[in-house]
């Protein structure tokens, strides 16, 4: 069966059908259809006029625009907001109400697109493998990146959040049109990976989405990963307009300036320093999303009940951080170069540079304490693989499972850990997992391309698909019209399950208690330790491009940074090294195919020896179930804030030192809304509340942007990366 | 100017099809998707279903599928609606409607068919 | 399919006044349109998304709202604005309000 042209709300558009073997099976393939007007610079997306006649939908349609890999020019176009949707058929009748899934890619908020990197004449986020094996329908999509998607004034003037409105636009476009293309509009999944992963849970949380979206997976990134929020948007809106010639001394002015700048010159205006750096695509990302005071309404730990009704599956890889540290600590990698405690207590430092001494040296203390035992190099390696995966990935997922869990009524979640190891060959044997390493599993590259994979790999992309997709259709991994190798139990805040994704699945693969110490390390005591004053906490500028990387100071010189008890906003981005440029989290379309090259010949990466799929191992002692992470108005997932937290905490009801661990009651309580003009955000509601989405705050065409800092002329942001 | 002319008023029996036609004239009959609405008496407005005069690509909305067959004749600029099956609820006046610019609203309308389905 | 719901269903006012209909979509819409349509007549387009006016309609009538409210305002109301108005949505499955039946005071 074929589908033939589909009407939508834009009018007939055609695709292509693709057979599948001898049996009669297909798949509907659409490329570029639509789902938003040609974006016009720093605006939010616009509604489609429209066509007449036939569209034919064949090809995929060029990424938003973006800077080149070596920063010297720009591709892509202002024209990008279209959306691709792979439709499985079997041989007689066209395919009715099928669970859809829409993958949102990742890419740091500064690159990417909806059909990723091209290797082996087979795009990354192709969706076929996805949609004919699970018998879901498949939708990617493009939508703005880097100072288009994201630059923001911090007020009405510019609000940002461009990109994430954007994706909205294709998640709304698709529930109003699926069902002509078989799916079923009340049976939407959002997944996606890294930034990609955050702004599934960012979707997820704003009240614009509004039963729009029935379940999500976030792999590798949640909304309360340190790198997804940015406190000091004008800080970095100033910077880009110094170089393109905007006046930066009244923001209405600047922002209509900026509106009117060639987007090509926006877009180079922000340049990352990659001198010296062994990977390009890891750099500090100043345009990322912002609280609005509309489209995300207050800080994202404060929205969980709206996603109460939201299955939810989130995971991390056991070494998502490897690909940062290496980048901070270039001797990760390198067999002949030893990682010595000085080198490691100085990353450890810049990640904890609000908390000064003291939380340099804690963190340092319980990081470093399986060293006496085993002093190895191979081991200290790790912990600095082990340290940045916690504090960018492990952590805040974990603390977002139990916001989601807290706040859920009928919703379930579910938790894992990627650890099939990395296939990039010039790695040591002990790395597992590397940041992104997923993505080709889930997209099923080891069927679609085999001659660069091994059949245990196929096996890990078998389950993998066979979970999200039963995942998709029920809401539960492990029911639905595919087999999977054991049984994934939901998570919950007792139990801590999480399921250990390997080659080889059994009973054993279900676990507890997924770093029990460290989550508990960062959730309670380092949040308690004192927060030093900005004069203490003074990062060293790196060398480099000064004019391309400022280097602000760490807060607000006229007040003490905030302790983050309360409200303190997001938390920062974390320091992660003296490279000058923060890692931030890589996609599969980051330029590099999925597969990890071996050179230029194309040949398969050689696979690497031994079973280095082992997750990292968690220190022995009280091994009982972690705690359950704040869901107060704590704001503060286990990085520290910086300087400019933001508005004073509202304290949390009753105890008013100790951050409020989530009730197991239902509370009944509603959310404060937060007015958008308020100078603290609303309390959360305390368990299963039964409340309300927090709404937007105000109209959305003209929304209030609560006050920052940053607006005042002296403060500029606290990025303690630098 | 653009101008639809519709056939006229038909009595037909339960169980019975009626084809009802479209003329257009004022423009180019294969640049704009026309749409057939109907309205029963004293009632709203309901959408039937949309053809693409240009390659004859339809669609219809999930109350009709089945019964329901647009189709055109560029030769003579004219698209038909074919209803089968017909039942007594199916009295009601069909409008045919062209798309204003785009994927716009119904911008043009025909002057409407009463059809009535009575034994 | 997405349900449109326009209030009031009838209304009675006067020449010169202002009048104001409302119309709610289900879920957050692209495209929504006002209708007018006289007794025996076809419909007649008079706003199309959402806030601009068909060509030869009078700059009496005015569109608003976006997302899942929308109103049609009549500014000063002319004998010849007594009708029943639609409002309509365009998704892949078009629907239309129940209707609001605009009648002299």
């Known amino acids: 069966a074929k589908l033939g042209a589909v009407y939508t709300e834009g009018g007939f558009v055609e695709g292509v059908n693709k057979k599948l073997g001898l049996l009669g099976d297909s798949v509907d393939i659409f490329k570029g259809i639509p789902f938003a007007a040609p974006t016009k610079a720093l605006e939010n997306p616009q509604p489609h006029p429209g066509w007449q006649g036939t569209l034919k939908a064949k090809n995929f349609k060029k990424r938003c625009l973006q800077a080149t890999i070596t920063q010297d020019s720009t591709y892509g176009d202002e024209d990008c907001l279209y959306l691709n949707i792979w439709v499985p058929q079997g041989r007689k009748q066209v395919s009715r109400d099928l669970p859809v899934m829409i993958w949102i890619y990742g890419g740091a908020f500064l690159m990417g697109s909806g059909h990723g990197a091209n290797f082996l004449n087979n795009y990354l986020y192709d969706g076929e493998e996805i949609a004919t094996r699970g018998n879901v329908i498949v939708v990617t999509f493009n939508y703005r990146v880097g100072p288009l998607g994201f630059l923001s004034t911090g007020d009405a003037n510019l609000p940002g959040n461009y990109g994430l409105r954007d994706q909205h636009m294709a998640i709304a476009w698709v529930k109003r049109n699926i069902a002509a293309f078989g799916g079923d509009p009340n049976n939407i999944t959002l997944f996606g990976e890294s930034a990609g992963g955050a702004s599934v849970s960012l979707q997820t949380l704003s009240p614009y989405n509004k039963g729009l979206i029935r379940r999500a997976i976030s792999q590798s990134g949640v909304a309360l990963s340190p790198w997804v929020i940015q406190k000091n948007p004008l800080f970095w809106a100033k910077k880009v307009a110094e170089k393109v010639g905007c006046p930066v001394g009244d923001a209405a002015r600047m922002a209509q300036c900026l509106k009117v700048t060639d987007p090509r010159a926006l877009t180079l205006a922000y340049k990352v320093p990659l001198a010296g750096l062994e990977y390009p695509m890891l750099h500090y990302v100043g345009f990322v999303p912002v609280i609005d005071g509309d489209f995300i309404p207050a800080d994202p730990i404060n929205l969980y009940a709206n996603a109460a009704d939201i299955d939810y599956i989130a995971g991390t890889n056991n070494m998502d951080g490897h690909i940062f540290a290496s980048i901070d600590m270039p001797a990760i990698n390198k067999g002949n170069k030893k990682v010595t405690e000085e080198d490691f207590y100085k990353l450890v430092s810049e990640f904890t540079i609000t908390k000064g001494l003291r939380g340099a040296k804690t963190t340092f203390d319980v990081y470093t304490e399986s060293w006496a035992q085993d002093p190895s190099q191979e081991n200290k390696k790790k912990t600095v693989v082990d340290f940045e995966t916690d504090v960018l990935f492990l952590v805040p997922t974990e603390i977002a499972l139990a916001q989601h869990r807290a706040n859920a009524k009928s919703a379930k979640t579910y938790a894992y850990l990627f650890s099939h190891p990395s296939r990039m060959p010039v790695y040591p044997k002990w790395v597992g997992a590397d940041h992104a390493d997923d993505i080709q599993y889930v997209f099923g590259k080891p069927f679609a391309t085999p001659t660069g994979y091994r059949p245990q790999d196929r096996t890990v992309s078998k389950a993998m698909i066979a979970y999200w997709t039963n995942f998709a259709k029920t809401g539960d991994p492990n029911m639905g019209d595919s087999a999977v190798p054991t049984h994934w139990e939901p998570y919950t805040t007792e139990n801590s399950g999480y399921l250990e994704i390997t080659k080889k699945m059994g009973s054993s693969s279900m676990k507890r208690s997924l770093r029990t110490n460290f989550l508990r390390y960062w959730t309670l005591t380092y949040l308690a330790l004192p927060t030093v004053t900005d004069q203490e906490a003074t990062p060293v500028p790196p060398t480099g491009d000064s004019e391309a990387t400022p280097v602000p100071p760490t807060g607000d010189s006229e007040t003490a940074p905030v302790p983050p008890t309360g409200d303190s906003g997001a938390p920062p981005v974390p320091p992660t090294g003296d490279s000058g440029a923060p890692p931030v989290p890589p996609t599969g379309d980051s330029g590099a195919p999925p597969v990890p090259p071996t050179g230029d010949s194309g040949a398969p990466p050689v696979p690497p020896t031994g079973d280095s799929g082992a997750p990292p191992v968690p220190p022995t002692g009280d091994s009982g179930a972690p705690p359950v992470p704040p869901t107060g108005d704590s704001g503060a997932p286990p990085v520290p804030p910086t300087g400019d937290a933001g508005p004073p905490p509202v304290p949390p009801t009753g105890d008013s030192g100790a951050p409020p661990v989530p009730p197991t009651g239902d509370s009944g309580a509603p959310p404060v809304t937060p007015t958008g003009d308020s100078e603290t955000a609303p309390v959360p509601p305390t368990g299963d509340s039964g409340a309300p989405p927090v709404p937007p705050t105000g109209d959305s065409e003209a929304a209030p942007v609560p006050p920052t800092d940053d607006s005042k002329e002296a403060q500029m942001p606290a990025v303690i990366r630098f | 100017q653009v101008q639809l002319v519709q056939s006229g008023a038909e009595v037909k029996k339960p169980g019975a099809s009626v084809k009802v036609s479209c003329k257009a004239s004022g423009y180019t009959f294969t640049s704009y998707n026309m749409h057939w609405v109907r309205q029963a008496p004293g009632q709203g407005l309901e959408w039937i279903g949309v053809i693409n005069p240009g390659d004859g690509a339809t669609s219809y909305a999930q109350k009709f599928q089945g019964r329901v067959t647009m189709t055109r004749d560029t030769s003579t600029s004219t698209v038909y609606m074919e209803l089968s099956s017909l039942r007594s609820e199916d009295t009601a006046v069909y409008y045919c409607?062209?798309?204003?610019?785009?994927?716009?609203?119904?911008?043009?309308w025909g002057q409407g068919t009463l059809v009535t389905v009575s034994s | 399919d997405i349900q449109m719901t326009q209030s009031p269903s009838s209304l009675s006012a006067s020449v010169g006044d202002r009048v104001t209909i409302t119309c709610r979509a289900s879920q957050s819409i692209s495209y929504l349109n006002w209708y007018q349509q006289k007794p025996g007549k076809a419909p007649k387009l008079l706003i199309y998304a959402a806030s601009s006016l068909a060509s030869g309609v009078p700059s009496r009538f005015s569109g608003s709202g976006s997302g899942t409210d929308f109103t049609l305002t009549i500014s000063s109301l002319q004998p010849e604005d007594f009708a029943t108005y639609y409002c309509?949505?365009?998704?892949?499955?078009?629907?239309f309000g129940q209707g609001t039946k605009l009648e002299i005071k």
């Open positions: 309509h949505q365009r998704s892949s499955s078009p629907t």
């Open positions: 409607a062209r798309d204003y610019y785009g994927s716009s609203p119904l911008g043009y």
